[in-house]
Amino acid sequence: LPAQVAFTPYAPEPGSTCRLREYYDQTAQMCCSKCSPGQHAKVFCTKTSDTVCDSCEDSTYTQLWNWVPECLSCGSRCSSDQVETQACTREQNRICTCRPGWYCALSKQEGCRLCAPLRKCRPGFGVARPGTETSDVVCKPCAPGTFSNTTSSTDICRPHQICNVVAIPGNASMDAVCTSTSPTRSMAPGAVHLPQPVSTRSQHTQPTPEPSTAPSTSFLLPMGPSPPAEGSTGD
C-alpha cells in the first residue's frame, strides 16, 4: 500500500526533514506549511493547527515561500536619476536602475543604490571606453590627425578632413579648415575611428622608455600628416 500522505502539521519521522514548502517549527516540533510569495505568517502553527497566512500590506512584499511574521518593506521610491524597472508588488521589491546618460556607481543586491552621470569628454579628448550600466566613460586625448570639438559622453575623436589647400590646420579640438575648394576626402586615409592613445594639443613626445614605463605607441598613429602644434601655454 502507498504511504499515507501526512497533512500539516505533522511530526516528522526521526532523522527526516520536512517536505518542500514546509518548515520545521521548533516550538510545536511539527512540520508546518510555509506561506506563499506575497504572504506572511499571521499565526504560527501549533501541534493541532497549521500556519495561518495573510497577504502582505501595501508597499511590502515577500518573494519566497516563507514563515516570516512580517513582510519586507519595499525600497524607497526611485530617485530622479533612476527609472523604476520593476514595480513594488506583494511578491517583489521595487528595482531602480540608472536612467540613460547615467551609470551605477554603487550597486545593491538588485538594482542600483547610487547613480552618477556619465563622464563627458571635453574638447581635445574622445571617448576611449564607453560607459556601461555599471562603469563610467573613459576619455583619452585625440591622436594626431583626429579631433573632438564637443563635450560628450559618446563622441569619439574624428579624423581631420583632408584639404587640397589648408586654410587653418586642425588640432586636437578643432577640425582642419579648407580653403573654398572642397576637401579631397572627408577622412584621413588609415585614420582609426576609435579613440586614439595619442593626443595633439601641442607637439606630443614619447617618453624615453624605462623599465615598466608606458610603451611607445608610434605604431598606433594614424597615417597622414600630423597637425602642427597648437600653442601651449607658458611664458
Partner: antibody, heavy 119, light 106 residues
Framework: QVQLVQSGAEVKKPGASVKVSCKAS????????IHWVRQAPGQGLEWMGW????????DYADKFKKRVTMTADTSISTAFMELSRLRSDDTAVYYC????????????WGQGTLVTVSS | DIQMTQSPSSLSASVGDRVTITCNGS??????LAWFQQKPGKAPKLLIY???SLQTGVPSRFSGSRSGTDFTLTISSLQPEDFATYFC????????FGGGTKLELK
C-alpha cells in the same frame, strides 16, 4: 580615497637634473591624465604639461619642451617628472594633479615637492 | 596663447563680507574655467569647474559666473577659513592659470 603622494624635497646644483615622483592610489591610474604644475616661492601657479599614463603620451608647455620629460609606470601607479639643466629660477614646489579629461579638472593634487636649485 | 588676467591681485575683507574676484580671458574659452583655493604650504584645492559647477564638498557660499570673457568667483559671506589665495585656470585651449588673488583679513 583618492591620494597622490609625491617624493621628498630635493636640493640640486645648477645644470643638474631632478626627477619627482607622484604615486596614485584610490582610483584607476590609467583612466586619468596627470598634470604637473609648479610654484616658485611667493609666485603663482605655472602649468608644465601632462602625461597620459595609459600610453605615455605627453603635452608640454612651450617653455619646458626642451627640458622636461614626463613618464609613467603603470605597474606601480606612479608618474614621474624630470627637469634637466636646472637653473636657480627652477626653485619651486612641484605639484602633480589628476584630470579625467571631462569638465571636472584637477580634482586631486599631490602634496607638492620642493626642489631647491642652488650652487 | 590665451592669457588670463586676474584682478585684484590682493584684497582685504572682513568676515561676513561678500567678495568677488574676476578673471578675464584674452580669447574665448567657452566655459572651461576653474577656480582653485590655496592656503600657505598647501596644494591648491578645486572649488569650481566649468565656470559654474561647485566641486563636491565645497560650501555653497562659493559660486562662479560669467559675462562674455569675464569670469567671476563670488564668496557670498566670508568665513575665517576663506582667507587664502585664489587662482583661476583656463583649460579650453592649452592650460593657463591667472596670476592669483590674495584674500586677507582687513
Amino acid at each position: 580615497q583618492v591620494q597622490l603622494v609625491q617624493s621628498g624635497a630635493e636640493v640640486k646644483k645648477p645644470g643638474a637634473s631632478v626627477k619627482v615622483s607622484c604615486k596614485a592610489s584610490g582610483y584607476t591610474f590609467t583612466d586619468y591624465i596627470i598634470h604637473w604644475v609648479r610654484q616658485a616661492p611667493g609666485q603663482g601657479l605655472e602649468w608644465m604639461g601632462w602625461i597620459d599614463p595609459d600610453y605615455g603620451n605627453t603635452d608640454y608647455a612651450d617653455k619646458f619642451k626642451k627640458r622636461v620629460t614626463m613618464t609613467a609606470d603603470t605597474s606601480i601607479s606612479t608618474a614621474f617628472m624630470e627637469l634637466s639643466r636646472l637653473r636657480s629660477d627652477d626653485t619651486a614646489v612641484y605639484y602633480c594633479a589628476r584630470d579625467d579629461a571631462s569638465p571636472l579638472v584637477m580634482d586631486a593634487w599631490g602634496q607638492g615637492t620642493l626642489v631647491t636649485v642652488s650652487s | 596663447d590665451i592669457q588670463m588676467t586676474q584682478s585684484p591681485s590682493s584684497l582685504s575683507a572682513s568676515v561676513g563680507d561678500r567678495v568677488t574676484i574676476t578673471c578675464n580671458g584674452s580669447q574665448n574659452i567657452d566655459n572651461y574655467l576653474a577656480w582653485f583655493q590655496q592656503k600657505p604650504g598647501k596644494a591648491p584645492k578645486l572649488l569650481i569647474y566649468s565656470t559654474y559647477s561647485l566641486q563636491t564638498g565645497v560650501p555653497s557660499r562659493f559660486s562662479g559666473s560669467r559675462s562674455g570673457t569675464d569670469f567671476t568667483l563670488t564668496i557670498s559671506s566670508l568665513q575665517p577659513e576663506d582667507f587664502a589665495t585664489y587662482f583661476c585656470f583656463q583649460y579650453n585651449n592649452g592650460y593657463m592659470f591667472g596670476g592669483g588673488t590674495k584674500l586677507e583679513l582687513k
